[in-house]
């Protein structure tokens, strides 16, 4: 379900990634240099920026981030 409207709830931040708010709603997600072989699974729909550099992701399936706008 959708998360309630609140100023005190943190948006979903994938394990081991670093996250930083981007304005009132959005989230910048830095998952660089984590040795990932696939995309992080619990990305917030409010992700405005995603850094996956310096990982081991060799291929992406079609529409790999369906939850993102």
């Amino acid at each position: 379900g959708s998360s309630p409207r609140s100023g005190v709830l943190l948006r979903g931040c994938p394990t081991h990634c670093h996250c930083e708010p981007d304005g009132r709603m959005l989230l910048r997600v830095d998952c660089s240099d984590l040795g990932l072989s696939e995309l992080p699974s619990n990305l917030s729909v409010f992700t405005s920026y995603l850094d996956l550099s310096m990982n081991n992701i060799s291929q992406l399936l079609p529409n790999p981030l369906p939850s993102l706008r």
Epitope: G7, V8, L9, L10, C13, T15, H18, E20, M25
Partner: antibody, heavy 117, light 107 residues
Amino acid sequence: QVQLQQPGAELVKPGASVKLSCKASGYTFTNYWMQWVKQRPGQGLEWIGEIDPSDSYTNYNQKFKGKATLTVDTSSSTAYMQLSSLTSEDSAVYYCARSLSGYVDYWGQGTTLTVSS
Amino acid sequence: DIQMTQTTSSLSASLGDRVTISCRASQDISNRLNWYQQKPDGTVKLLISYRSRLHSGVPSRFSGSGSGTDYSLTISNLEQEDIATYFCQQGNSLPPTFGGGTKLEVR
């Protein structure tokens, strides 16, 4: 710089109501939520509720519904919390604090509320 | 409500020590954890959000880690100005809840 100004202390009688104020400056008041937190002497922190000054939307901790009412006056960039039917259990320090995307980045100095006859 | 537990209510350490303060949630909070510092005069400051993101102006000797239900705040080189009470807070679901606090004292 960001400032949240709260009165240092309030003394009220049991059964009465009190309206605590929190005057914000140094930022755009309607761009941030305002949180209210209670701390009893020697105790931890307890979230009371929050208000979005842009449209006065509120969320309350179920425990404080009927006890606390949050409002804002955007013309003076001031947030208020009214506490009703006061008892000694309401004696505490009350903090206002602003938040954005899930974390509370600036806190007021707190108002010490004493309920005593 | 999610319960946040800081098992150590007070901690004594020497200046220069590496200090770790732990916090446990009653359920998985998916890294949605903040740490706050409360000075003896009551002043409260944000240290860390999103489990590990240092707030602007916070010294780099502070760091946060953990996952799932278990999280920790580490001060790598304790200074006099760090003497305070430290609270964790979950931002996973309403109502947000705080740990009981860990009071840090100088040995």
